[in-house]
Amino acid sequence: TLNSVLNSNAIKNLPPPLGGAAGHPGSAVSAAPGILYPGGNKYQTIDNYQPYPCAEDEECGTDEYCASPTRGGDAGVQICLACRKRRKRCMRHAMCCPGNYCKNGICVSSDQNHFRGEIEETITESFGNDHSTLDGYSRRTTLSSKMYHTKGQEGSVCLRSSDCASGLCCARHFWSKICKPVLKEGQVCTKHRRKGSHGLEIFQRCYCGEGLSCRIQKDHHQASNSSRLHTCQRH
């Protein structure tokens, strides 16, 4: 089952003390089967794995990618999975750990010298031929921080949002990905109703900025489903 697959993974996403934030001083960690941490005036334990559901790689950590944990497993469930190290199999750049990228189905080091010449080739190859673009997996094509010494400005080629300067995200533009501005209040946004539909966007928008969510514009409630306009609105 999905649960047994998940529970076989490494310890991840440790909870903080109740009501606190992660990394709270005094949090204690024990080995499996559980995590030990303070709750009230006594220590409590928690299962050692907390599945983190996702729809896109950007929702996961930089050392993770978003995918279904088992082939033919629970349909529609995608969670954040640990990135794959060098020489491990991959289907897209996102699956490889930072400092690596996916070439011919294997995670290889993103050596600055040879990587730049291949970047367009691998992005186009992924978009055009790789079945993973349409199978419900999201694609986080990602440049290692080694690629650029400075964060990408608007319009710079990127592979992950962390390659872009603050206030920008990495989004698809034609067959490559560039840094685009994070959406502000009132700007039109994309709400992905159908899972995997973001894989079909040629001009991808960034997500809504801090404190905003993508919702139907008030005066568009009466419109037909297909013409409903979504904008970034305050929570």
């Epitope: 729809a55 995608q78 899972k195 801090e210």
Partner: nanobody, 125 residues
Amino acid sequence: EVQLVESGGGLVQAGGSLRLSCVVSGGTFSVYAMGWFRQAPGKLREIVAAISRTGSSIYYADSVKGRFTISRDDAKKTVYLQMNGLKSEDTAVYYCAVDGRANGERPAVAGYNYWGQGTQVTVSS
């Protein structure tokens, strides 16, 4: 200060239903994944259900599949857990947890970094 407040717990007969709510207040961050956990006396705290930022990916523990439904309302910064067909083994303290991130922030590993104080659910047979 960030606060997560759960409500909706209580005593219910086996086979009955309850709807838990958790409201996130304070803090200026985007809420990513949201989840419900539970802890029965003498047992480990375990995940019950979790929902992704967009709501398109939902995880359920095997023990609650087909009986519990998680949903979220971003406008209200609230996550819900609809619990139907309750069994005595569902008796536990239920906690909600969320992943709150400042704009552009991305941790190495995604996780739930804000937790509520819990609400008691007791199912009598």
